[in-house]
Interface confidence: medium
Amino acid sequence: KFSKQSWGLENEALIVRCPRQGKSSYIVDWYYSQTNKSIPTQERNRVFASGQLLKFLPAEVADSGIYTCIVRSPTFNRTGYANVTIYKKQPDCNVPDYLMYSTVSGSEKNSKIYCPTIDLYNWTAPLEWFKNCQALQGSRYKAHKSFLVIDNVMTDDAGDYTCKFIHNENGANYSVTATRSFTVKDEQGFSLFPVIRAPAHNETKEVEIGENTNLTCSACFGKGAQFLATVQWQLNGNKITDFSEPRIQQEEGQNQSFSNGLACVNTVLRIADVKEEDLLLRYDCLALNLHGLRRHTIRLSRKHHHHHH
């Protein structure tokens, strides 16, 4: 409960906000959840707490884990959890689903793409913007404050947009990138019974005990903007929110991508520190629209190590 997913790339800055709301004057204590060890507030540390914010300057893959914040007001103590995953830099241009922020839709009249999480950082304009890893050039693109505006939006403008900026902390600069999909609303759309692209039905995924793993639920629903199109994970037939295990989280927001003109939605189930009992669970990817519901099941199994003599 009160757990928020945050992710970033190694060697970039990552700033995470405690998911409990309160006043800036409240005292906030941060801990490593596993060890209950307090996180220092001194800025000379690479990872330090600063009120409601937890700062990784820069982040390392080993920082991944669950962090506890306790917000102490004069009347209550409130506990929250930040589930942090730091990934290795991708060697190629492809941005995997688990690094994507929520999708935004645009039309000819409104084509603003906000840079996700930027409000947490101390940055100065201008932002750099990339589409499918190519720097955006031309008068159609205007970087304005924390968002990008595209003039005369066309269907070709759909794709993955990355903003890049510099966070400054006490004179030191750290790079930050964030990517989200942009979809263009198409008037001539239609909807179909959901088609689940991943996982395959009754698939089994091999995992290492103690490692993190991600399961992607991806389905297509038709062409163009969809009135209702949702994908979600269930555990043993129960909603993720009813399953009180902070290690297992469904990402906030759903990424919408267009594959061959089809409207497809993804959501990632993140499982931190895989345990034996996770192998006993049934993981259901549910895709729902006005036509109905489709379900694909996936199970986890322990990775077999082949010993060579």
């Epitope: 409960k1 009160f2 006043k23 007001s73 009347t75 209550f76 909603k239």
Partner: antibody
């Protein structure tokens, strides 16, 4: 001991405006949120809104939006709730209560407002 | 807006009885549910916050449970001084009180 002392009962005519005060003692009003709650005679509790007195940020329940104004004077540790365009159904006891963003911990004694022509 | 359905609206029980009051929300909320007691002619008093955390000074016969959309306040052994109206409050999105449950002694 935290204490919240509210102003006295009021009788108002329909269409008028009422302003209730809530003075906090043994507590700095800036340190937490101040909420206001309505309770009509024989009825349940209804949250009206809250203020962060340190910065003046307010949020109001949809039902009262446009008619209620919550303010705070940090120099006197006093919060105020003003309700305009009064009608007979606004006859109620109004409570101030201090707490965090999510809930109320300490309550004032209540102020009865009677709206009658 | 989040709607709260509190039940029952009133109930009568004997001293020593186990009493449960339920609040159901129309949407999944985190455990941002709190329980208040209001004795006749008195101001409301916070009993339980965040689903199941007892406020200091509140007798241990009071407990809270539930998650998602269904929440329960339980009085394990009803005492005469528990005669009051009980309200749940959600604060997942703004704040909304339940309609209240008036508890009387048989």
């Amino acid at each position: 001991e935290v204490q919240l002392v509210q102003s006295g009962a009021e009788v108002k005519k329909p269409g008028a405006t009422v302003k209730i005060s809530c003075k906090v003692s043994a507590f700095n009003i800036k340190d937490d949120y101040m909420h206001w709650v309505q309770q009509a005679p024989g009825k349940g509790l209804e949250w009206m809104g809250r203020i962060d007195p340190a910065i003046g940020n307010t949020e109001y329940a949809e039902k009262f939006q446009g008619r209620v104004t919550i303010t705070a004077d940090t120099s006197t540790d006093t919060a105020y709730m003003e309700l305009s365009s009064l009608r007979s159904e606004d006859t109620a006891v109004y409570y101030c209560a201090t707490g965090d963003f999510y809930a109320m911990a300490y309550w004032g004694q209540g102020t009865l407002v009677t709206v009658s022509s | 807006d989040i709607q709260m359905t509190q039940s029952p609206s009133s109930l009568s029980a004997s001293v020593g009885d186990r009493v449960t009051i339920t609040c159901i929300t129309n949407t999944d909320i985190d455990d941002v549910i709190h329980w208040y007691q209001q004795k006749p002619g008195k101001v409301p008093k916070l009993l339980i916050y965040e689903g199941n955390t007892l406020r200091p000074g509140v007798p241990s016969r009071f407990s809270g449970s539930g998650s998602g959309t269904d929440f329960t306040l339980t009085i394990s052994s009803l005492q005469p001084e528990d005669v009051a109206t009980y309200y749940c409050l959600q604060s997942d999105n703004m704040l909304t009180f339940g309609q209240g449950t008036k508890l009387e002694i048989k």
